[in-house]
Protein backbone atom coordinates (compact mmCIF):
# COMPACT_ATOMS: atom_id res chain seq x y z
CA UNK A 1 0.00 0.00 0.00
CA UNK A 2 1.35 3.41 -0.98
CA UNK A 3 1.01 5.80 1.94
CA UNK A 4 3.46 8.52 0.96
CA UNK A 5 2.75 12.01 -0.27
CA UNK A 6 4.85 14.34 -2.37
CA UNK A 7 5.08 18.02 -1.53
CA UNK A 8 6.33 20.22 -4.36
CA UNK A 9 7.11 23.85 -4.95
CA UNK A 10 3.78 23.98 -6.75
CA UNK A 11 2.98 26.60 -9.39
CA UNK A 12 5.95 28.93 -9.72
CA UNK A 13 7.07 31.74 -11.95
CA UNK A 14 10.46 33.17 -12.76
CA UNK A 15 12.00 35.79 -14.97
CA UNK A 16 13.46 35.11 -18.39
CA UNK A 17 17.24 34.74 -18.09
CA UNK A 18 17.00 33.87 -14.41
CA UNK A 19 17.14 30.58 -12.58
CA UNK A 20 14.72 28.52 -10.51
CA UNK A 21 14.94 25.60 -8.12
CA UNK A 22 12.50 22.74 -8.62
CA UNK A 23 11.99 20.76 -5.44
CA UNK A 24 9.90 17.81 -4.31
CA UNK A 25 9.80 16.08 -0.95
CA UNK A 26 8.41 12.62 -0.25
CA UNK A 27 6.96 12.12 3.21
CA UNK A 28 4.68 9.79 5.20
CA UNK A 29 6.37 6.61 4.01
CA UNK A 30 9.26 4.47 5.18
CA UNK A 31 9.90 3.28 1.62
CA UNK A 32 13.48 3.41 0.36
CA UNK A 33 13.99 6.04 -2.36
CA UNK A 34 16.11 4.31 -5.00
CA UNK A 35 15.99 6.96 -7.71
CA UNK A 36 14.41 10.28 -8.63
CA UNK A 37 13.83 11.23 -12.26
CA UNK A 38 13.13 14.80 -13.32
CA UNK A 39 11.09 15.21 -16.49
CA UNK A 40 9.74 18.03 -18.59
CA UNK A 41 6.71 16.86 -20.56
CA UNK A 42 8.08 13.34 -21.16
CA UNK A 43 11.62 14.49 -21.77
CA UNK A 44 14.24 13.41 -19.29
CA UNK A 45 16.10 16.25 -17.59
CA UNK A 46 18.05 14.39 -14.95
CA UNK A 47 18.36 11.26 -12.86
CA UNK A 48 19.40 11.22 -9.23
CA UNK A 49 20.19 7.69 -8.12
CA UNK A 50 20.40 7.38 -4.35
CA UNK A 51 23.55 5.28 -4.48
CA UNK A 52 25.16 6.34 -7.74
CA UNK A 53 24.63 10.08 -7.90
CA UNK A 54 23.44 12.40 -10.67
CA UNK A 55 23.09 12.08 -14.41
CA UNK A 56 22.10 15.18 -16.38
CA UNK A 57 20.70 14.66 -19.88
CA UNK A 58 23.21 15.82 -22.51
CA UNK A 59 20.77 18.26 -24.07
CA UNK A 60 20.32 20.05 -20.73
CA UNK A 61 23.87 19.88 -19.37
CA UNK A 62 24.57 23.57 -19.97
CA UNK A 63 21.40 24.79 -18.22
CA UNK A 64 20.61 22.25 -15.52
CA UNK A 65 22.47 21.80 -12.25
CA UNK A 66 21.88 19.05 -9.70
CA UNK A 67 20.50 19.94 -6.31
CA UNK A 68 19.97 21.23 -3.80
CA UNK A 69 19.30 17.77 -2.37
CA UNK A 70 17.10 15.81 -4.74
CA UNK A 71 15.94 19.04 -6.37
CA UNK A 72 17.00 20.52 -9.68
CA UNK A 73 18.19 24.01 -10.62
CA UNK A 74 17.22 25.39 -14.04
CA UNK A 75 19.37 28.24 -15.30
CA UNK A 76 19.24 30.76 -18.18
CA UNK A 77 15.48 30.42 -18.38
CA UNK A 78 13.63 31.11 -21.62
CA UNK A 79 9.91 31.41 -22.29
CA UNK A 80 10.13 27.95 -23.89
CA UNK A 81 10.83 26.54 -20.44
CA UNK A 82 7.26 27.32 -19.44
CA UNK A 83 5.34 24.13 -18.76
CA UNK A 84 4.93 21.11 -16.53
CA UNK A 85 7.80 19.44 -14.70
CA UNK A 86 7.58 16.14 -12.88
CA UNK A 87 9.63 14.56 -10.13
CA UNK A 88 9.31 10.79 -10.28
CA UNK A 89 10.28 9.05 -7.06
CA UNK A 90 11.13 5.40 -7.58
CA UNK A 91 10.80 3.71 -4.20
CA UNK A 92 11.07 0.22 -2.80
CA UNK A 93 8.81 -1.47 -1.96
CA UNK A 94 6.05 1.13 -2.47
CA UNK A 95 6.53 1.82 -6.17
CA UNK A 96 6.41 5.17 -7.96
CA UNK A 97 5.32 8.55 -6.65
CA UNK A 98 4.90 11.53 -8.97
CA UNK A 99 4.99 15.22 -8.13
CA UNK A 100 3.99 18.00 -10.54
CA UNK A 101 5.33 21.54 -10.80
CA UNK A 102 4.12 24.15 -13.25
CA UNK A 103 6.70 26.76 -14.21
CA UNK A 104 5.83 30.00 -15.99
CA UNK A 105 8.74 32.02 -17.35
CA UNK A 106 7.84 35.68 -17.57
CA UNK A 107 9.23 38.42 -19.76
CA UNK A 108 8.52 41.04 -17.12
CA UNK A 109 10.29 41.56 -13.82
CA UNK A 110 7.18 40.59 -11.87
CA UNK A 111 7.56 36.91 -11.00
CA UNK A 112 5.71 35.65 -7.96
CA UNK A 113 6.21 32.27 -6.39
CA UNK A 114 3.12 30.16 -5.90
CA UNK A 115 2.15 28.38 -2.73
CA UNK A 116 3.17 24.85 -1.89
CA UNK A 117 0.60 22.14 -2.36
CA UNK A 118 0.45 18.40 -1.82
CA UNK A 119 -0.07 15.57 -4.29
CA UNK A 120 -1.33 12.36 -2.69
Amino acid sequence: MMTGTIETTGNISAEKGGSIILQCHLSSTTAQVTQVNWEQQDQLLAICNADLGWHISPSFKDRVAPGPGLGLTLQSLTVNDTGEYFCIYHTYPDGTYTGRIFLEVLESSVAEHGARFQIP
Epitope: D42, L44, F86, H90, T96, T98
Partner: nanobody, 122 residues
Framework: EVQLVESGGGLVQAGGSLRLSCAAS????????MGWFRQAPGKEREGISL????????YYADSVKGRFTISADNAKNTVYLQMNSLKPEDTAVYYC???????????????WGQGTQVTVSS
Protein backbone atom coordinates in the same frame (compact mmCIF):
# COMPACT_ATOMS: atom_id res chain seq x y z
CA GLU B 1 4.70 -2.36 -19.20
CA VAL B 2 8.32 -3.50 -19.14
CA GLN B 3 9.30 -7.05 -18.22
CA LEU B 4 12.83 -7.85 -17.10
CA VAL B 5 14.40 -11.30 -16.80
CA GLU B 6 17.80 -11.78 -15.17
CA SER B 7 20.13 -14.73 -15.60
CA GLY B 8 23.72 -15.66 -14.92
CA GLY B 9 23.78 -15.88 -11.15
CA GLY B 10 25.30 -18.78 -9.28
CA LEU B 11 27.95 -19.96 -6.86
CA VAL B 12 31.52 -18.84 -7.45
CA GLN B 13 34.73 -18.82 -5.46
CA ALA B 14 36.28 -15.58 -4.22
CA GLY B 15 38.35 -14.02 -6.98
CA GLY B 16 36.17 -15.53 -9.67
CA SER B 17 33.91 -13.93 -12.27
CA LEU B 18 30.27 -14.00 -13.32
CA ARG B 19 28.30 -12.22 -16.02
CA LEU B 20 24.71 -11.32 -15.30
CA SER B 21 22.25 -10.65 -18.11
CA CYS B 22 18.99 -8.74 -18.04
CA ALA B 23 16.67 -9.11 -21.01
CA ALA B 24 13.99 -6.43 -21.40
CA SER B 25 10.72 -6.83 -23.26
CA UNK B 26 7.45 -4.95 -23.54
CA UNK B 27 7.21 -1.17 -23.76
CA UNK B 28 10.94 -0.46 -23.99
CA UNK B 29 10.99 2.22 -26.70
CA UNK B 30 11.82 5.08 -24.37
CA UNK B 31 13.69 3.68 -21.41
CA UNK B 32 15.79 6.34 -19.72
CA UNK B 33 18.13 4.03 -17.87
CA MET B 34 18.74 0.48 -16.79
CA GLY B 35 20.65 -0.56 -13.76
CA TRP B 36 21.65 -3.25 -11.34
CA PHE B 37 20.80 -3.35 -7.67
CA ARG B 38 21.60 -5.93 -5.05
CA GLN B 39 20.14 -6.89 -1.72
CA ALA B 40 21.98 -8.90 0.91
CA PRO B 41 20.06 -10.54 3.75
CA GLY B 42 18.98 -7.97 6.32
CA LYS B 43 20.19 -5.03 4.22
CA GLU B 44 18.55 -2.41 2.03
CA ARG B 45 18.48 -2.73 -1.72
CA GLU B 46 21.64 -1.04 -3.01
CA GLY B 47 22.18 0.49 -6.44
CA ILE B 48 25.49 -0.71 -7.82
CA SER B 49 25.49 0.29 -11.49
CA LEU B 50 23.48 2.32 -13.99
CA UNK B 51 23.65 2.91 -17.74
CA UNK B 52 21.69 5.67 -19.45
CA UNK B 53 20.08 5.47 -22.86
CA UNK B 54 20.69 9.08 -23.91
CA UNK B 55 24.47 8.94 -24.06
CA UNK B 56 25.45 5.58 -22.59
CA UNK B 57 26.85 7.10 -19.41
CA UNK B 58 27.76 4.51 -16.80
CA TYR B 59 27.80 4.88 -13.04
CA TYR B 60 29.14 2.60 -10.32
CA ALA B 61 28.98 2.35 -6.55
CA ASP B 62 32.36 2.70 -4.87
CA SER B 63 32.07 -0.86 -3.59
CA VAL B 64 32.19 -2.31 -7.12
CA LYS B 65 34.14 0.33 -9.06
CA GLY B 66 37.00 -1.21 -11.03
CA ARG B 67 35.62 -4.73 -10.61
CA PHE B 68 32.17 -4.59 -12.23
CA THR B 69 31.31 -3.36 -15.72
CA ILE B 70 27.84 -2.57 -17.04
CA SER B 71 27.14 -2.70 -20.77
CA ALA B 72 24.17 -2.81 -23.10
CA ASP B 73 23.35 -4.58 -26.34
CA ASN B 74 20.57 -2.48 -27.81
CA ALA B 75 19.91 -4.94 -30.61
CA LYS B 76 19.11 -7.63 -28.05
CA ASN B 77 17.49 -5.26 -25.54
CA THR B 78 19.82 -6.71 -22.95
CA VAL B 79 21.99 -5.20 -20.24
CA TYR B 80 24.96 -7.05 -18.80
CA LEU B 81 26.91 -6.84 -15.58
CA GLN B 82 30.39 -8.31 -15.80
CA MET B 83 31.56 -9.04 -12.27
CA ASN B 84 35.26 -9.74 -11.73
CA SER B 85 37.39 -10.25 -8.60
CA LEU B 86 34.30 -11.25 -6.67
CA LYS B 87 34.39 -11.08 -2.88
CA PRO B 88 32.28 -12.88 -0.24
CA GLU B 89 30.68 -9.51 0.56
CA ASP B 90 29.29 -9.43 -2.99
CA THR B 91 26.94 -12.25 -2.00
CA ALA B 92 23.37 -11.02 -2.55
CA VAL B 93 20.32 -11.26 -4.75
CA TYR B 94 20.99 -9.12 -7.83
CA TYR B 95 18.10 -7.26 -9.44
CA CYS B 96 17.86 -5.56 -12.78
CA UNK B 97 15.75 -2.41 -12.98
CA UNK B 98 14.60 -0.14 -15.78
CA UNK B 99 13.41 3.43 -15.58
CA UNK B 100 11.16 5.03 -18.17
CA UNK B 101 8.99 8.08 -18.75
CA UNK B 102 6.05 8.92 -16.54
CA UNK B 103 3.50 8.09 -19.21
CA UNK B 104 -0.07 8.81 -18.14
CA UNK B 105 1.33 10.03 -14.81
CA UNK B 106 0.39 6.80 -13.07
CA UNK B 107 1.42 3.19 -12.77
CA UNK B 108 4.85 1.70 -12.34
CA UNK B 109 7.74 3.32 -14.17
CA UNK B 110 10.45 1.50 -12.24
CA UNK B 111 10.30 -2.08 -13.43
CA TRP B 112 12.14 -4.76 -11.46
CA GLY B 113 13.31 -8.18 -12.47
CA GLN B 114 12.74 -11.20 -10.23
CA GLY B 115 16.35 -11.30 -9.07
CA THR B 116 19.19 -13.77 -9.42
CA GLN B 117 21.23 -15.13 -6.51
CA VAL B 118 24.98 -14.61 -6.49
CA THR B 119 26.93 -16.47 -3.80
CA VAL B 120 30.66 -15.94 -3.40
CA SER B 121 32.38 -18.51 -1.21
CA SER B 122 35.70 -17.99 0.48
Amino acid sequence: EVQLVESGGGLVQAGGSLRLSCAASGNIDRLYAMGWFRQAPGKEREGISLITSDDGSTYYADSVKGRFTISADNAKNTVYLQMNSLKPEDTAVYYCASSGPADARNGERWAWGQGTQVTVSS
